[in-house]
Interface confidence: low
Amino acid sequence: SGPLPKPSLQALPSSLVPLEKPVTLRCQGPPGVDLYRLEKLSSSRYQDQAVLFIPAMKRSLAGRYRCSYQNGSLWSLPSDQLELVATGVFAKPSLSAQPGPAVSSGGDVTLQCQTRYGFDQFALYKEGDPAPYKNPERWYRASFPIITVTAAHSGTYRCYSFSSRDPYLWSAPSDPLELVVT
């Protein structure tokens, strides 16, 4: 018999955690697991418990995590990696829409995230979407073109800026931008 199936690893309430705010990492395997191992990659930090409660997020806790479990002498495959991001490390960027935040269905709009600092990475979040759009941009202005806009593009957007040198330390979120599709 091969390795045990991998567990799942999630961050609650979110894997984007403002500095000094709490987050819980939870490793979930099948019922009756003998032992869990939750580890922070590229470090020697680990714990033999399924749940890691971080009462106040710190810069040094940002990074990649994974977990596995043991039943008898068998270890499971490792979970998918979880990227835990500390936000609020840097000042917020500004988010704007060109030509404007109101766009006709079928039209085009570009969301631009701008920062005064020398960041080369930007992430755009739409409220309700699970994952960000990431866009490396050399000139510190990230453009996210949305071609042929539909009603599904309506919503609230925020962007973050960060550096590829420290990819898990992000700025505070920009002020929200409401995109209206008419």
Partner: nanobody, 129 residues
Amino acid sequence: QVQLQESGGGLVQAGGSLRLSCAPSGRTISSVDVGWFRQAPGKEREFVAHVTWSGGSTYAADSVKGRFTVSRDNAKNTVYLQMNSLKPEDTAVYYCAAALNGAFRDSWYPALWDEYDYWGQGTQVTVSS
């Protein structure tokens, strides 16, 4: 709120010993992880040693390993840094710091300053040659 008070610093000759104490008020020390740091003039704050809340795990930086030991006495609500075979380069202000609920409790290596919640005012240690 936790206030930390270090004591035991002073002037000592190279090769001598000192024992620093750290006594928190406002909270029993048995519920916090405690680290020691030091800062020499014009230098960065440097991690020295750490003891977990249970005392079950201690860690010392390479620069002091074998010379400094950290321990705790929860009954006396005090954490100690025993410093032996002191060298002139150990001259610095020594700070103790408390982490109210450290993540990864007993595998906290290396201890990083930003994970500590409260800091003492520091005690001066001067080692003369």
